[in-house]
C-alpha cells in the first residue's frame, strides 16, 4: 500500500518498486536511520540509485538546482531528496502535490519520535554561498598580501636610510 | 584566457552548460545564461548579462558556444571583485540585514566555505574586522579598510 | 519473543464510545514508537494514529481526527486508543503496531511487530 498514489498502474512512470529502490539503498548511505546525508555524499547517492530516479554523474550542478532545503551541519533530509527526484519523473503538477502530501504524512505518522527539522539554506543558496565566501577570502588574502608588501617595503626603507649612520 | 581555469572549475562549467543544453546541440541561447550562471553561484545582474553577451556572441545570433562560455567565465573569475561586489558578497551572510555579520559566523562562513582560511588568517581577519572586540563585525567599514589602497 | 494483544473492541452504537488496549511484552517498551491501525472487510489496511517516546504530539489520519486520542503508559506497557463518537465506517479489525523508534520507515506497513487485530463494529 506504500506510496500507492500515482502507482497503481504498471505503465505509470512511477511505481512502488521504485519508492522501496530509494530506500534500501538510503539505509546504505544512511545505517543509523537518522534520516539526513550529508551533502557531501549527495553526489554519490543520486548516482547509485536506479532508473527513473537516479540522476547519473556528472550531478554537482543538477542536484544544486534541485534546491534542496539544507539543515545545519549540511544535511538534506531523505524525503526532500525523494520529492525532488520524483518531481523531476512526474514533472509540477497537482498530482505530483499530492503525492508528495501523502507521502509526507505517511513518513512523519511511521516516525513519530522524529524531531522536526528546520531548514537553513539550500543547495543553490549554498553554490550561492560558497562564491562570495570565496570573494571575501580572496578579498582579504590580497589585502594580508599588500599589507606585508607595505611592511617589506617600509622595513626595506628603514634599514637602507638608517645604513648611512655608521 | 581559459587555460587560467582548472581541470575542476572546467568541469564544472561543462556540467552547467550541458545541463541547459537541451538539444545537445553545443550551445545554449543567451536567454538560458543566466540560468547557467546562478547554477554556478553567480548573481549576474541583467545589464552585466547583457555585456557578458555582447562581449562574446559576436555575430549576434543569440547563442554561445562552450568555448565562447569559458571564455566569458575566465574573464569573470580573472576580474579583481570590486568594493561593492565584495560588501554584496558579505550581505549574504547578514541574514537581519542590519549591516553586521558576529564574529562567530564569520569565523564559521570563512573556515567552511570556499577557500578555506586557516585558523590564523581568520584569527588576524576578525582582529581587523571586529574592532571594538563587541562580537560583531561592521562589514560596510571592514571592506573599505579591505579595499584601501 | 515479542507480542502485543489488543483487546476493548465490541459492538457499539453510532455515537458512542470504546477503549482499545494494546499490551506489549518482549521488547523495551519506552523505546519504541507505537501506532493504531485498521482493515474493514475488503478495503486496504489504513493508518489510524501513532504515538511515538519523544514529547512530540500523537499523529492522527484525518478521518479519525478529534475524535481518537491514542496514550501510552510506559510503566503498563500498554498503548490505548480513546475512540469517541464512533461512526459505521470505523467498523474494521484494529491492530496495534510497534517499531524501534531509532529506526526510519517510509510507512506503518514496515513496522515490524503487529498484534493479531481486535474486531470493533459500529451499528445501531
Known amino acids: 500500500e506504500n506510496f500507492n498514489v500515482a502507482t497503481e498502474e504498471s505503465s505509470e512512470p512511477l511505481g512502488e518498486d521504485d519508492f522501496e529502490m530509494f530506500y534500501e539503498t538510503w539505509e546504505k548511505f544512511d545505517p543509523d536511520a537518522t534520516q539526513f546525508i550529508a551533502y557531501s555524499r549527495l553526489s554519490d547517492f543520486v548516482d547509485t540509485l536506479q532508473e527513473p530516479l537516479r540522476i547519473a554523474k556528472p550531478n554537482k550542478i543538477k542536484l544544486i538546482t534541485l534546491d534542496l532545503p539544507m539543515v545545519p551541519g549540511d544535511k538534506i533530509h531523505c524525503l526532500d531528496i525523494l520529492f525532488a527526484l520524483t518531481k523531476e519523473v512526474l514533472g509540477d503538477s497537482g498530482e505530483m502535490d499530492a503525492l508528495k502530501q501523502t507521502m509526507e504524512e505517511k513518513f512523519m505518522a511511521a516516525n513519530p519520535s522524529k524531531v522536526s527539522y528546520e531548514p537553513i539554506t539550500t543547495t543553490l543558496k549554498r553554490k550561492h554561498e560558497e562564491v562570495c565566501a570565496i570573494k571575501i577570502q580572496r578579498a582579504y588574502r590580497r589585502h594580508l598580501l599588500q599589507r606585508s608588501m607595505k611592511q617589506a617595503s617600509y622595513m626595506y626603507r628603514h634599514s637602507h636610510d638608517g645604513s648611512g649612520d655608521d | 584566457m581559459a587555460d587560467q581555469l582548472t581541470e575542476e572549475q572546467i568541469a564544472e562549467f561543462k556540467e552547467a552548460f550541458s545541463l541547459f543544453d537541451k538539444d545537445g546541440d553545443g550551445t545554449i541561447t543567451t536567454k538560458e545564461l543566466g540560468t547557467v550562471m546562478r547554477s554556478l553561484g553567480q548573481n549576474p545582474t541583467e545589464a552585466e548579462l547583457q555585456d557578458m553577451i555582447n562581449e562574446v556572441d559576436a555575430d549576434g545570433n543569440g547563442t554561445i558556444d562552450f568555448p565562447e562560455f569559458l571564455t566569458m567565465m575566465a574573464r569573470k573569475m580573472k576580474d579583481t571583485d570590486s568594493e561593492e561586489e565584495i560588501r554584496e558578497a558579505f550581505r549574504v551572510f547578514d541574514k537581519d540585514g542590519n549591516g553586521y555579520i558576529s564574529a562567530a559566523e564569520l569565523r564559521h562562513v570563512m573556515t567552511n566555505l570556499g577557500e578555506k582560511l586557516t585558523d590564523e588568517e581568520v584569527d588576524e581577519m576578525i582582529r581587523e574586522a571586529d574592532i571594538d572586540g563587541d562580537g560583531q563585525v561592521n562589514y560596510e567599514e571592514f571592506v573599505q579598510m579591505m579595499t584601501a589602497k | 519473543q515479542v507480542q502485543l494483544q489488543e483487546s476493548g473492541g465490541g459492538l457499539v452504537q453510532p455515537g458512542g464510545s470504546l477503549r482499545l488496549s494494546c499490551a506489549a511484552s518482549g521488547l523495551t517498551f519506552a523505546n519504541y514508537d507505537l501506532a493504531w491501525s485498521r482493515q474493514a472487510p475488503g478495503k486496504q489496511r489504513e493508518f489510524v494514529a501513532s504515538?511515538?517516546?519523544?514529547?512530540?504530539?500523537?499523529y492522527y489520519s484525518g478521518s479519525v481526527k478529534g475524535r481518537f486520542t491514542v496514550s501510552r503508559d510506559n510503566a503498563k506497557e500498554t498503548v490505548y486508543l480513546q475512540m469517541n463518537d464512533l461512526k459505521p465506517e470505523d467498523s474494521a479489525v484494529y491492530y496495534c503496531a510497534a517499531k524501534d523508534a531509532s529506526v526510519t520507515v517510509a510507512t506503518i506497513e514496515d513496522y515490524p511487530y503487529w498484534g493479531r487485530g481486535t474486531q470493533v463494529t459500529v451499528s445501531s
Open positions: 504515538i511515538g517516546v519523544t514529547r512530540n504530539p500523537p
